[in-house]
Each structure stands twice: as C-alpha cells, then as structure tokens.
Interface confidence: low
C-alpha cells in the first residue's frame, strides 16, 4: 500500500479550499497541528485541519446531502405535481361540461323548466366538485337533493301547469311526495350507483396523486442526523486535512455510508412500491360506472329519461299528489 | 336580473358532439401517469445508489479514500468505513426512521389500502337491483361501448369520451358556483366539445 | 316585506349551550341559503355556518366545527343554531343572514337585526 | 383560508367630497367563467349590515348610484362621489369565492 503523501507544509492548498466554503481564513491553522480536539476527522499525524472546520464541513456536508436528495427526487416531484394539477383541472372541466350538457338537455326539451333547473343543477354540479376535492358530502344526499328540488318545478309547470299561482307553497309537500311515491322510478338510485362510485375512484384518485406529493416533499426536506453528518463528512471532507484535495471517496465506502444516512427513508422503499401498484390497479379500473368522465357526461341522458318517467305517469301522479299535497294548498308560506 | 342566462339558446341541429377518434382521453393520460409512474417504483430502495454515482466517486482512479485513509481502490480497506469505533453504522439503522417518515408511511399505508378497497372486481357494470323498475330507456349492456346515449329531441349525442383537455378555455357555464352569479356569456350557440 | 328576527341570545357560562333562531318572513322561506354570521365585541364579521335551501348542506367555520349546528325547519320558516362547549371567544352579536338564491354559494342580500350572546364565568 | 385586508381602519371626509376605501384579498377573487367575487357591506351605527355591492362592481338594489366598486382580482375599491351624512358607518369587504367565507376588518367613513 502506499504511503499517503505528506501534508501540505503550510496547509495552503486547505486554506485556499476552505476560503470558498467560508470566506475569512481565521479556522484554518498555518501549518499542520496534532489536531488532538477533533471529533470526526480524526488524524493519524499533523493535520491542517480545525475544530471549527470540521464543524462548517458537517454542516456542508448534510447541506450537500439535502441537495443531492431533492435533485434525485425533482423529476418524480414534477412528474406528480403536473400530473395531480392536470387532472384535478381536467376533472373540473369533465364536470364544466357534463353541467352545459344537462343544462342544454333542459334549455331543449323542458324549458318551461328553466330557470329554476338551471340553479339545482347547478348546485349539483358545484358539490360534484366539491366532492371531489375532498369535501364530506354525502353522494346519495346530492342525488336526492336535485330531485328533490327538480320534482316540484316538474309537477307546477309540466304535469299541473293551471295551479292557481296561491297554491304554489306545495314545496315541501312535494318534496316529500317525491320520495314516497318514488315519482322518478329507480333512476335517482340508478344515478346514486353511478355517481357515488365514479366519484369515490376519482376522489380516492386525486387523494393518492396528492400524497405522492407528500411522501416526495417529506423525504425531500429530511433533516439528516447528526451521526449521519460525521458520517459524510468523514467520507467527503477529511480527506482535505491531509491536503489530499483530489482524492475521491471509495465506491463502496460510499454505498455504506448512505445506506447507514438513509437507513429511515428507504424503509419507505415496500410502501412506495405497493402505492404504485395499487395505483395502477385503480386506474386499470377506471371505466364505465368507475369512470367519472363517461358517468358524469351521460348524466343528462339520465336525467331525461327519469321526467320521461314522471310524465309517462303523470296522470296517476297527479290525482295521488292532489289527494296528498291538498292540504298544503291551502296554506301559504309567505 | 341577469342570474339566469336567458339568451342561451342551443340549436338542436347542431348539439352534435364531434366524433372524434385517437383523441387523448382521460383514461389514455391516466394509463401514461402510470407507466411513468412505474419507472420509479425502486426511487426508495436505489437512493443511496443514485447519491452515490452523482456525488464524487472514485471510478477511473487507482486510489480512493476509506473515510480514514488513502487506498487502493479494489482493496478490501476500500469497503471499509473507517469508523470502526467511532460510529456503529448499525445502530444508525437501528435506530429505525424519522418520526415524520413514520408518519409518511402510516399515510401510505392508508392508502394503500383505499387504493386496494377501491380497486373493483371487473364485472356486472350495474347492480342487479338497479334493473328492477324495468327502465323503457334501455340500460347499458356489459358489452356496450358506452352508456351515455341520447333519448329524445334535441339530446346531445356523446360519441365518445371528452377529448382530453380540449379546450381549458371553452366555457358556457349557466351558473357561478361557488359564487353563484350565474351569468353566462355563451361563446357558441352549439355546445360541442370539440373545437377546431 | 323581506324580515328576518334572531332570538335566543342571553348570558351564559363558558361549556355551557344554547340555541338561536331565526324566524323568517317576507319571501319563501324554503327556496333560499341561509347563514349565520357574527361581529364580535371588536366589531369584526365572522362567518359561522351556512345551510342550503333544502337544508342536505351545512359549511362551518373551522373554530365551531364539532360544536356548533346549523339547521332549518322550511315549514315553520325557520332557521336555528345550536351552540354547545362555548367559549369566551364566542362572544358576539350573532346575525342571520340570507343568500341571494337557493345555493349554497350566493352571497348575502338581507341581514337580521341580531341577536347577543355573552360567554362569561 | 383567504384573507381579506383593509388597511385602513377609518378615513375622514368632508360632506360632499369623494372619497374611495380599499381590500386586498390573499388569493384571487376572480373565478373561472369571469365573475369576481368580492362583495361590499356597510354597518351604519346601531344597525346591521347591508349589501351594497357584489360581484366586485355590481350595485345592490336600492343602493344610490353615488356608490361604486371596482378592482383588480386581488384589489379593491369602493368609491363614494359626494358623500352624504347617510354613509357614515363601517364598510367591510368580503370574499364569497371559497369557504370559509371571509370578512376585511372595516373600515370606518367619518365625516370632518
């Protein structure tokens, strides 16, 4: 083996590298010193190296390492940033859209519904995307409130157009009589199926998306300890107290050393690949009822057949409603 | 009031949406994500590899340094850390992850198991009790390629799905939600999609 | 005539609850968002929680969440609110608030007269 | 959540004079289909709030044309031409575009 060269007779050359990490040359001795206080760099002879100097090079070397990490994570970082920003806005505009259809399918086919129709589909809409980013409501309770709030603009202007205008505080009565008669057949459960599960996937989608934002954010800005900073600074650094400036660390010495510094994140190693996989399994589910696009865009379709339903029937409805809500005629609200 | 958009006029000839084949779709982008995706599936576990090879390495040279001393680089001291005494590289792993790195993998493990709860057998599109009322409009078939026909005048025939992003700036919204102002200023007399 | 009459406010010890309500008149009831909003002694506005016209959607402010319930009765025309663990800091003049339409998400056209509330041991 | 700053905790002005009051919002009020949401109330003494403006430039009925709003998606004014004795009170901005609904702190027109 060979003799490691002798130490720069003056420290110079440590000086001059020194005096880039930390401008004034107060830390570094003039010539080698026994160097007896250093705690990580410990020499075998004279050294041009001081306490304080070890200290800056720690903090550099966990510095680098930080650095090091959030270089080798950038392109999974922007890879999920874009992809979660891309679709949540794409999901919006699904949701955009598939609200102008419904709209479109009144403003067509029962404008006597509109403006009322405009405003409940609105809402609907509104807490479809709500719903998406995360807010706790409740699918079915949506699905039951555009019906619910449907049902009497329907039976005032489609089904008993001539109801004198004092008799048009039957809301809640109607609202209730649309429940119980089940006055829109199975088509507002049909929808509760449809929406309930095409949003839970897309929610649960943009939820995990957003996580993986997370795990990368969290190991990005990770604190390295400070056995973990001797460590690195060992490895990078003590080699200049020699006044070996050029020399590099060992491959494997290398490899040691990092997977003793990323002991704890590289536990998250079995979870971050089961994440992958299981997000693969979502997506590779993601169509027809678990799609929200085609869901969300058939809605109108939907929603058309279920007043074709009600005004199929009409006729019996409306003697049954007349019976139930004739009461609440009478009463105003006011 | 202008709440209501009252010029939104929609001529029933034209609310055609646009077939539009190899378009990219949603679905198409998603299956991308994840192809991507799967290339770092090893992020984790290759970490302390990737530091290494972009942080200075001895590679060409004959010798390197051991964190003690100057050795030749194929040499068994090449491997060793020369820190025999000082630092236990062992109790460092020992010593298990960061309280924040626990909790990034309790979070993981949560959903995880979402993702896995969600993940749906691939059969009957439709529940069976759904087929109950004898729906006249027809429901989707397994073997149907969509189930967002139209019934009626005037219905908007969806061929096939949104072209991805077709247009961010295309809106006719009827309503303002969450402001809720609902004034319109329709862009087109044609809800279409697509574009050109 | 658009009216809305707060009632219910008094003194109370902090941990203790009470219930406010709103009676409503002057427009249907029924078809319209509602809200409470407070100014408390330092005269600034707080929004505390919102209710949808069919009342399937509550919204609260963080700092009541847990202890405060918002609900309506469409039939009696009325709105309420239901405090419970109250704290100092809940002190104010609680308002009733309408919105412009039946959402959610319209803005707030007619205010109540107030009513007040005094947490204090 | 957004927060909505008025600088100004009062401003003086004389009967007949014009004067404007300003909020800044922490995020953009304006919302995708072009509708900025930023709404302006006025508390008289001893009474409640009332809408004077919404949407950001948009004048509440019964308000008299003297007032008007205007801005920018994170800026605001509301300016008053000729004030009158009438307007003197507190004037609160507000956002309506997310929950939590948040208020400005007031700011309060006093008459020299």
């Known amino acids: 083996q060979p003799p490691p060269p002798p130490p720069d007779a003056t420290c110079h050359q440590v000086r001059s590298f020194f005096q880039r990490l930390q401008p004034g040359l107060k830390w570094v001795p003039e010539t080698p010193v026994p160097g007896s206080d250093l705690q990580v760099c410990l020499p075998k002879g004279p050294t041009c190296c001081s306490r304080k100097m070890e200290e800056k090079y720690q903090l550099t070397a966990r510095l680098n390492m930080e650095q090091l990490l959030q270089s080798a994570s950038m392109e999974l970082k922007f890879l999920i940033i874009q992809n979660a920003a891309v679709f949540q806005e794409a999901f919006e505009i699904v949701v955009r859209h598939a609200k102008n259809y419904t709209n479109a399918m009144f403003k067509n086919n029962y404008p006597s519904l509109t403006p009322q129709a405009f405003e409940f589909v609105g809402e609907f809409f509104t807490d479809v995307s709500l719903y998406i980013l995360g807010s706790d409501i409740n699918v079915d309770d949506m699905v039951n409130e555009l019906f619910d709030s449907l049902f009497p603009v329907i039976y005032t202007q489609l089904m008993n157009p001539g109801l004198p205008d004092s008799a048009l505080d039957i809301n809640e009565c109607l609202r209730g009589a649309r429940r119980d008669l089940k006055v829109f057949g199975n088509f507002p459960k049909l929808i509760m199926t449809q929406v309930s599960k095409s949003l839970q996937v897309t929610r649960i989608f943009l939820q995990a998306l957003n996580l993986g934002i997370e795990v990368i954010n969290t190991t990005d800005h990770l604190k390295f300890s400070k056995d973990c900073g001797r460590m690195l600074t060992r490895m990078w650094y003590c080699s200049y107290c020699q006044g070996l400036m050029m020399v590099k660390p060992c491959g494997g010495y290398c490899n040691v050393v990092m997977q003793g510094c990323m002991a704890g994140v590289v536990e998250i190693d079995k979870y971050w690949r089961e994440y992958i996989l299981s997000l693969e399994e979502l997506v590779n589910g993601m169509y027809r009822i678990y799609d929200m696009e085609n869901v969300l865009l058939g809605l109108f379709s939907t929603i058309h057949d279920s007043i074709q339903y009600v005004q199929k029937n009409a006729g019996k409805l409306t003697t049954t409603i007349g019976k139930l809500c004739a009461h609440s005629q009478q009463r105003q609200y006011r | 009031s202008a709440y209501y958009p009252e010029d939104l006029f929609i001529d029933k000839k034209v609310l055609k949406v646009a077939h539009v084949e190899h378009e990219e779709t949603l679905s198409s982008r998603r299956r991308e994500l994840i192809q991507k995706l799967k290339s770092f599936i090893s992020f984790y576990s290759a970490l302390p590899g990737y530091i290494c090879s972009h942080s200075p390495v001895a590679e060409n040279d004959t010798l390197c340094w051991n964190g003690q001393e100057l050795v030749e680089r194929y040499s068994q001291k090449a491997a060793r850390n020369g820190m025999k005494n000082q630092f236990n590289l062992h109790e460092l792993k020992m010593k298990g992850p960061e309280p924040v790195v626990s909790q990034i993998i309790d979070k993981l493990k949560h959903i995880n198991q979402l993702l896995r709860t969600m993940s749906m057998p691939k059969g009957r599109v439709l529940d069976k009790n759904l087929d109950e009322e004898g729906f006249e409009s027809g429901d989707c078939g397994d073997d149907e390629d969509e189930c967002i026909g139209g019934s009626g005048d005037g219905m908007i025939k969806v061929k096939n799905q949104l072209r991805f992003l077709a247009e961010l700036a295309y809106d006719l919204d009827v309503d303002d939600a969450p402001g809720n102002s609902q004034q319109a200023t329709p862009k087109d007399n044609e809800i279409s999609t697509f574009h050109n | 005539e658009v009216q809305l009459v707060e009632s219910g406010g008094d003194s109370v010890k902090p941990g203790g609850s009470l219930k406010l309500s709103c009676a409503a008149s002057?427009?249907?009831?029924?078809?319209?968002?509602m809200s409470w909003v407070r100014q408390t002694p330092d005269k600034r506005l707080e929004w505390v929680a919102t209710?949808?016209?069919?009342?399937?959607?509550?919204y609260y402010q963080d700092s009541v969440k847990g202890r405060f319930t918002i609900s309506r009765d469409n039939a009696k025309n009325t709105l309420y609110l239901q405090m419970s663990s109250l704290k100092s800091e809940d002190t104010a003049i609680y308002y009733c608030?309408?919105?412009?339409?039946?959402?959610?998400?319209?803005?707030?056209?007619?205010w109540g007269q107030g009513t007040t509330l005094t947490v204090s041991s | 959540d957004i927060v909505m700053t008025q600088a100004a905790p009062s401003v003086p002005v004389m009967p007949g004079e014009s004067v404007s009051i300003s909020c800044r919002s922490s995020?953009?009020?304006?919302?995708?289909?072009?509708?900025?949401?930023l709404y302006w109330f006025l508390q008289r003494p001893g009474q409640s709030p009332q809408l004077l403006i919404y949407?950001?430039?948009n004048l509440a009925s019964g308000v008299p044309d003297r007032f008007s709003g205007s801005g920018s998606g994170t800026a605001f004014t509301l300016r008053i031409s000729r004030v009158e004795a009438e307007d003197v009170g507190v004037y609160y901005c507000m956002q309506h575009l997310e929950y939590p609904l948040t208020f400005g702190a007031g700011t309060k027109l006093e008459l020299k």
């Open positions: 002057g427009f249907t009831f029924s078809s319209y968002g």
């Open positions: 995020k953009s009020l304006l919302h995708s289909n072009g509708n900025t949401h």
């Open positions: 949407r950001m430039s």
């Open positions: 209710i949808n016209s069919g009342g399937s959607y509550t």
């Open positions: 608030v309408r919105h412009h339409y039946g959402s959610s998400y319209d803005y707030f056209d007619y």
